[in-house]
Interface confidence: medium
């Protein structure tokens, strides 16, 4: 019987070449985050938030992934291949496993943005 | 040193309600939860749920939520497991079992010597 | 509910020798970090005693000659060289979720 629920920024959308912030929220219990796991949609793990051991950023992603903010993570310099699903899983003591879900879609930059960002008045 | 104090039998009628006890001595009291187990004879332990002793909080077995109520007494230490309706099938010896935290991997690092439940008329 | 399958159900060692109890979990019980899997003995009248916490870590007071392995599904505790009061019932327990759940038990006889 297990209390609480994740909490998620849902469906989200970003451009190419920019960043984004995955962010999971556990609320209405009072277990005890030990440790918050980072997935991508194949399951390869971009990043552990350990409560004694702190952040690990496997290294895949090092470039790429930063930690924070709290609980959450930044995925910068995005590409066409980060579009799909993102996956926090939270261990908590004394619930066991709490997971949310983000959908991640990154968007093509128009001409017309770029062109209009570097237009010469 | 850490105690967990239960009395050795208790004799109850069926259907009449019982409330088992369980007295803690030896360490900080309110910074631990406390389970309880049923094993029956012959038979492995069924977990029937936990309480932390600062905030009453409660994780039930689904199959014991009809049947288990636990509550905590702050003042004396003291934690009960009441039993609705019982019958024979709730004759068992009952224990409860201190759980300690370790980063979320928790285990039960102390016993009491358990409560031999006898249902009968 | 995590399903916990041990095995053998009961077994029969010669005095000095190595007795070995498997645990199984329906899923997995281990993390990066950590593996959420205790082992127990209790004898007749008695409540269970902890032998080994997180897989492999043996509790204060227990005797070196248990030893505990595994991670993931798999997990094996090992007593060796027996002596005669390890005749007992040993069981497996996981912390992972709510609930908690044990295994079925290994009756252990010393010859």
């Known amino acids: 019987m297990m209390t609480g629920t994740i909490e998620t920024t849902g469906n989200i959308s970003a451009k190419k070449g920019g960043s984004v912030i995955l962010q999971c929220h556990l609320s209405s219990t009072m277990a005890q985050v030990t440790q918050v796991n980072w997935e991508q949609h194949d399951h390869s793990l971009l990043a552990i938030r350990n409560a004694e051991l702190g952040w690990h950023i496997y290294p895949a992603f090092k470039d790429r992934v930063a930690p924070g903010p709290g609980l959450g993570l930044t995925l910068q310099s995005l590409t066409m291949n980060d579009t799909g699903e993102y996956f926090c899983t939270y261990h908590t003591y004394p619930d066991g496993t709490y997971r949310g879900r983000i959908f991640l879609e990154v968007l093509e930059s128009s001409v017309a943005e770029h062109s209009a960002r570097f237009q010469i008045p | 040193q850490v105690q967990l104090q239960q009395p050795g039998a208790e004799l109850v009628r069926p259907g009449a309600s019982v409330k088992l006890s369980c007295k803690a001595s030896?360490?900080?009291?309110?910074?631990?939860?406390m389970n309880w187990v049923k094993q029956r004879p012959g038979q492995g332990h069924e977990w029937i749920g936990m309480?932390?002793?600062?905030?009453?909080?409660?994780r039930l077995n689904q199959n014991f939520l009809d049947k288990a109520t636990l509550t905590v007494d702050k003042s004396s230490s003291t934690v009960y497991l009441q039993l609705s309706s019982p019958t024979s099938e709730d004759s068992a010896v009952y224990y409860c079992?201190?759980?300690?935290?370790?980063?979320?991997?928790?285990?039960?690092?102390?016993w009491g010597q358990g409560t031999t439940l006898t249902v009968s008329s | 509910d995590i399903v916990m399958t041990q095995s053998p159900a009961s077994l029969v060692v010669s005095l000095g020798q190595r007795a070995t109890i498997s645990c199984r979990t329906s899923?997995?019980?281990?993390?990066?970090?950590?593996?959420?899997m205790h082992w127990y003995q209790q004898k007749p009248g008695q409540p269970p005693k902890l032998l080994i916490k997180?897989?492999?870590n043996l509790e204060s007071g227990v005797p070196a000659r248990f030893s505990a392995s595994g991670s993931g599904t798999d997990f094996t505790l090992n007593i060796h060289p027996v002596e005669e009061e390890d005749a007992a019932t040993y069981y497996c327990?996981?912390?992972?979720?709510?609930?908690?759940?044990f295994g079925g038990g290994t009756k252990l006889e010393i010859k």
């Open positions: 079992a201190r759980e300690r935290d370790y980063y979320g991997s928790s285990y039960f690092d102390y």
């Open positions: 309480i932390h002793l600062s905030n009453s909080e409660t």
């Open positions: 030896g360490y900080s009291f309110t910074s631990y939860w």
């Open positions: 997180n897989a492999s």
């Open positions: 899923q997995s019980v281990s993390t990066s970090s950590y593996s959420y």
């Open positions: 327990q996981h912390s992972w979720e709510i609930p908690r759940t």
